[in-house]
C-alpha cells in the first residue's frame, strides 16, 4: 500500500478524493483537506505541504489549489439573507428572504423575487423547501376560507356558530367566514357579515 507521492503510469490515483495526478513528475500526490490550500507542491521525494486558509477565506473540498477562496456575504439586493457564516471549510450559506423565492439558480440561488399573492379563497401549496419556487395557489378545502390577497395567508376553518351558542345566519364560503347570530334576534340586512352577540 504505497503512500503519496507514488509513481503512476496510468495517470490515475487510488483515492480520487484525497489524491491527484501530478503530470510533471508522473506521480500521485496528496490533496489538501477542506480549510487548507497547497503551500508547497509535491515532488518525487516530498508530498504536498498544506496550510490553513487565512481568515475570511475557505476551501470546501479536498483540493490542490494554491489559494483559498474569498468569503463573500449574501447579497441583500438580490433578496438573499444569511443562514450560516463562512468558515475555513465552507462558503457563506444563503437563502431567500422571507416572502421571496429563488428565481435564478446557478449551482446555488443567485436571485430571489417576491412570492405572488394567492387570491381570496386560495392558499399557497406547502412546499418541502421554503424559497425554492413561486407560490402555487390551491383552493381552500371544504369548510375553510381565506379572505385576503397574500403570499402567505392560510385557509382557516369556518366558525362553528353552535360552539358559541349562536346560530348560522349565512353559510361560509371559500372567501368568507360563516356569519353567526343570536338565536333570539333576527339579523337586520345592514348587519349581515357581522357577528351579533
Amino acid at each position: 500500500q504505497a503512500v503519496p507521492p507514488y509513481a503512476s503510469e496510468n495517470q490515475t490515483c487510488r483515492d480520487q478524493e484525497k489524491e491527484y495526478y501530478e503530470p510533471q513528475h508522473r506521480i500521485c500526490c496528496s490533496r489538501c483537506p477542506p480549510g487548507t490550500y497547497v503551500s508547497a507542491k509535491c515532488s518525487r521525494i516530498r508530498d504536498t505541504v498544506c496550510a490553513t486558509c487565512a481568515e475570511n477565506s475557505y476551501n470546501e473540498h479536498w483540493n490542490y489549489l494554491t489559494i483559498c477562496q474569498l468569503c463573500r456575504p449574501c447579497d441583500p439586493v438580490m433578496g438573499l439573507e444569511e443562514i450560516a457564516p463562512c468558515t475555513s471549510k465552507r462558503k457563506t450559506q444563503c437563502r431567500c428572504q422571507p416572502g421571496m423565492f429563488c428565481a435564478a439558480w446557478a449551482l446555488e440561488c443567485t436571485h430571489c423575487e417576491l412570492l405572488s399573492d394567492c387570491p381570496p379563497g386560495t392558499e399557497a401549496e406547502l412546499k418541502d423547501e421554503v424559497g425554492k419556487g413561486n407560490n402555487h395557489c390551491v383552493p381552500c378545502k371544504a369548510g375553510h376560507f381565506q379572505n385576503t390577497s397574500s403570499p402567505s395567508a392560510r385557509c382557516q376553518p369556518h366558525t362553528r356558530c353552535e360552539n358559541q351558542g349562536l346560530v348560522e345566519a349565512a353559510p361560509g364560503t371559500a372567501q368568507s367566514d360563516t356569519t353567526c347570530k343570536n338565536p333570539l334576534e333576527p339579523l337586520p340586512p345592514e348587519m349581515s357579515g357581522t357577528m351579533l352577540m
Epitope: G35, E55, N56, P73, D75, P76, E82, I83, A84, P85, T87, S88, K89, Q93
Partner: antibody
Framework: QVQLVQSGAEVKKPGESVKVSCKAS????????LHWVRQAPGQGLEWMGW????????QYNEKFKGRVTITADKSTSTAYMELSSLRSEDTAVYYC?????????WGQGTTVTVSS | DIQMTQSPSSLSASVGDRVTITCKAS??????VAWYQQKPGKAPKLLIS???YRYSGVPSRFSGSGSGTDFTLTISSLQPEDFATYFC?????????FGQGTKVEIK
C-alpha cells in the same frame, strides 16, 4: 493589531433608546463582520446581530428584531448598535466583536443600566 | 434556535488538576464550536475554534474535542490564572448561541 474600542457607560430610563459605538482599527473595516453580544449581570452571553460594513447590511437575532438597529460608518470605521424601548432586563454589558470561526476580537464592553 | 447545554455549571478544583467541561448542542453543528474564557469585568477570550483548534497564544494545556452534538474542553493541569468562567458557542447557524457557562473555582 486589531482593536475594537467602545463608547462609555450609559444610564437610561425605561422606554428610552441607547446607541453604543465601536471604533475598529488595525484591519480593513469593510471586509469583516462585526457582531454585537450582550451579557446581563451574572448571566451568559447573548448574540444580538451583525453588520457587514462593506455593504451596510445587518442581520438580527429574532429576539431583538424591531428594537435593535446596527449601522456602520465606513469613513470612521465605526459600528453602532442602537437598542430602543429599553426595559430593566436590558441592563447588561454590550460587546462588539469581530468574527471568524468564533469571536477572536472583542471590544472592552459598554455597561448600559436601565433604571427608573 | 440551537441550544448549547453546558455542564457542570460550576466546579471546584486545585492547581494541577485535570478539568473537563462538556457542551451538548441540541442539533448537529459539525465542528463549528468555539470555547472562551472570561474573567470578571473583562471581555471573553477565544481559546478554541473549530472544536479542537487552539487559538494563537493559548497555552497547550487547553484542548478541545468533539463533533456533531457533543463537545469537550479539557484543561490538562489547572494553573492559578485558569480560575475563570468558560463558555462554549456554536457558530454553525444563526442565531449564534452560547452555553450558560462553567465557573471554575479554587478548592
Amino acid at each position: 493589531q486589531v482593536q475594537l474600542v467602545q463608547s462609555g457607560a450609559e444610564v437610561k430610563k425605561p422606554g428610552e433608546s441607547v446607541k453604543v459605538s465601536c471604533k475598529a482599527s488595525g484591519y480593513t473595516f469593510t471586509t469583516y463582520y462585526l457582531h454585537w453580544v450582550r451579557q446581563a449581570p451574572g448571566q451568559g452571553l447573548e448574540w444580538m446581530g451583525w453588520i457587514y460594513p462593506g455593504n451596510g447590511h445587518a442581520q438580527y437575532n429574532e429576539k431583538f428584531k424591531g428594537r435593535v438597529t446596527i449601522t456602520a460608518d465606513k469613513s470612521t470605521s465605526t459600528a453602532y448598535m442602537e437598542l430602543s424601548s429599553l426595559r430593566s432586563e436590558d441592563t447588561a454589558v454590550y460587546y462588539c466583536a469581530r468574527s471568524w470561526e468564533g469571536f477572536p476580537y472583542w471590544g472592552q464592553g459598554t455597561t448600559v443600566t436601565v433604571s427608573s | 434556535d440551537i441550544q448549547m447545554t453546558q455542564s457542570p455549571s460550576s466546579l471546584s478544583a486545585s492547581v494541577g488538576d485535570r478539568v473537563t467541561i462538556t457542551c451538548k448542542a441540541s442539533q448537529n453543528v459539525g465542528i463549528n464550536v468555539a470555547w472562551y474564557q472570561q474573567k470578571p469585568g473583562k471581555a471573553p477570550k477565544l481559546l478554541i475554534s473549530s472544536a479542537s483548534y487552539r487559538y494563537s497564544g493559548v497555552p497547550s494545556r487547553f484542548s478541545g474535542s468533539g463533533s456533531g452534538t457533543d463537545f469537550t474542553l479539557t484543561i490538562s493541569s489547572l494553573q492559578p490564572e485558569d480560575f475563570a468562567t468558560y463558555f462554549c458557542q456554536q457558530y454553525d447557524t444563526y442565531p449564534f448561541t452560547f452555553g450558560q457557562g462553567t465557573k471554575v473555582e479554587i478548592k
